[in-house]
């Protein structure tokens, strides 16, 4: 009598994650009587995948009706494949007994699973940094197979070179992850800038996956301060303005000090945006010259985004103000941008 053969015609099968995989197996003879079982892996640690007689295998179905008389086809279909299903599958014939005895194994079919990378997630620094500082952005993507993948960083369309990328694990695995860090030098013009992490993989239909981050979340542009005096009004009041320009984000508190005493505090809100994404703000203070005998030292104190206050001082020369209406003023701007 001819020796029974267990035929697994495919040495290897490749499927996309989420699809079904058909693993073919036929036997050359109906005898001896006994069941067929499917295993993943060989040796004592092998994993039972399908046993017609018993067990619950929700994702595995027989391609042919194995209960049919004279059935010699024991192919199976595994649905909703994941990278964790990769491995070598063996169709094994047993001789009926108590217990059943393993008789013959097929040569095995290697199941390879191709899986797409997840959408890249880009995260920026936890705290804002000022222009001319370097910040790090991180990009992560997971669950892809095979391991080969390319990742590129762009800032406003220009590829970044200060990049460190790792694909894990280093050895053989059912699926892989990529993590990349890009260092970006901030400039005052970067409020509207964007960094893009672009991931290309064999499973993607020609279009890389992209993750983005806006530099507006990472940058702080400190303000420029300028204090100026307008001409004296008819009622002996001098209008002094504090121009706070080119700052980001909008969170800003301005305090006027007269001779060191707080005169008024204001919070910036609903400011119009400049073309470059920064903001400007102008605050006015009316000083009644006739109420003062000596010169008045005015200080515009700006606290931006929780940072230490920046001061700009200005002296109004009372002695230079004759008390007639409409006269010109003489003032001295003593200030520089001082930081407390």
């Amino acid at each position: 009598e001819e020796e029974l053969q267990v035929i697994q015609p495919e040495k290897s099968v490749s499927v996309a994650a989420g699809d079904s995989a058909t693993l073919n197996c036929t036997v050359s003879s109906l005898i001896p009587v006994g069941p067929i079982q499917w295993f993943r892996g060989a040796g004592p640690g092998r994993e039972l995948i399908y046993n017609l007689k018993e067990g619950h295998f929700p994702r595995v179905t027989a391609v042919s009706d194995p209960t049919k008389r004279n059935n010699m086809d024991f192919s199976i279909r595994i649905s909703n494949i994941t990278p964790a299903d990769a491995g070598t599958y063996y169709c094994v014939k047993f001789r009926k007994g108590s217990p059943d005895v393993e008789l013959k194994s097929g040569a095995g079919t290697e199941l390879s699973v191709r899986a797409k990378p997840s959408a890249p997630v880009v995260s920026g620094p936890a705290v804002r940094a000022t222009a001319e500082h370097t910040v790090s952005f991180t990009c992560e993507s997971h669950g892809f197979s095979p391991r080969d993948i390319t990742l590129k960083w762009f800032k406003n369309g220009n590829e970044l070179s200060d990049v460190q990328t790792n694909v894990d694990p280093a050895g053989k695995s059912v699926s892989y992850s990529i993590r990349s860090t890009a260092r970006v030098l901030l400039t005052r013009r970067d409020v509207h800038s964007q960094v893009i992490c672009e991931v290309a993989h064999v499973t993607l239909q020609g279009d890389p996956l992209r993750g983005t981050a806006n530099l507006s979340e990472a940058i702080r542009v400190p303000p420029f301060l300028e204090v100026t005096q307008q001409s004296m009004r008819a009622d002996n009041q001098v209008n002094v303005t504090c121009q706070v320009t080119k700052f980001y984000p909008q969170r800003l508190q301005l305090t006027w000090l007269e001779n060191g005493n707080v005169s008024r505090t204001e919070m910036a809100s609903a400011l119009p945006e400049n073309k470059d994404g920064t903001y400007n703000w102008t605050s006015w203070l009316l000083v009644n010259v006739s109420a003062h005998r000596d010169d008045v030292k005015l200080t515009c104190q700006v606290e931006h985004d929780g940072q230490p206050a920046v001061n700009k001082s200005f002296s109004v020369k009372v002695s230079a103000h004759p008390k007639e209406q409409g006269s010109n003023t003489a003032a001295e701007n003593t200030g520089t941008n001082e930081r407390n």
Epitope: S12, S14, S112, R114, I149, V202, Q205, G206, D207
Partner: antibody, heavy 116, light 109 residues
Framework: VQLVESGGRLVQPGTPLTLSCTVS????????MGWFRQAPGKGLEYIGI?????SPYYASWVNGRFTISKTSTTMDLKMNSLRSEDTATYFC?????????????WGPGTLVTVSS | DIQMTQSPSSLSASVGDRVTITCRAS??????LAWYQQKPGKAPKLLIY???FLYSGVPSRFSGSGSGTDFTLTISSLQPEDFATYYC???????????FGQGTKVEIK
Amino acid sequence: VQLVESGGRLVQPGTPLTLSCTVSGFSLSSYVMGWFRQAPGKGLEYIGIISSSGSPYYASWVNGRFTISKTSTTMDLKMNSLRSEDTATYFCARVGPLGVDYFNIWGPGTLVTVSS
Amino acid sequence: DIQMTQSPSSLSASVGDRVTITCRASQSINSYLAWYQQKPGKAPKLLIYSASFLYSGVPSRFSGSGSGTDFTLTISSLQPEDFATYYCQSWHYISRSYTFGQGTKVEIK
């Protein structure tokens, strides 16, 4: 699933020509498509691909001479200023469902002859 | 660009013979290699993808092996319908470009 190329004909050197690849049985928005050519008695040569979203990529030798574009059911290859060495059978092909590293469906080809 | 060198450029064999065609890449392409069969006046037909995976409907006498730079297509027992030209094709995952070998013509001895 079928691909059919059209537009191939005899043209004079310097003439432009556009080839079309009409697909049926699947959506062009789901697959990368490619153009290839084969000069008489020679081997296969890659021209370029167009991604599922419509971004074209070309072989380095193309140098802007050819342009790949697509609509919902056709992919076009626009060839500027043809030369005698462009005489070839032009094939369109679709990548496999598992990835972009191989082409599993090919059209029968269309012959372009460039001669004065 | 990656160069693909296929050998031999032609071979003569008889029905039933075992035939081996090799393809070498100028740099590693991992397992991104496909094999095609082409008959005169016809379009190429995919045989093997990802270096060793038999495409659906292709007879099991065709097999592929190799990874990195060296690849092999084997026809275990040549049949009359197998007389054709065979091409290898690589895909490079960094440049995302394709390159073909120059072809191997399998003729009847």
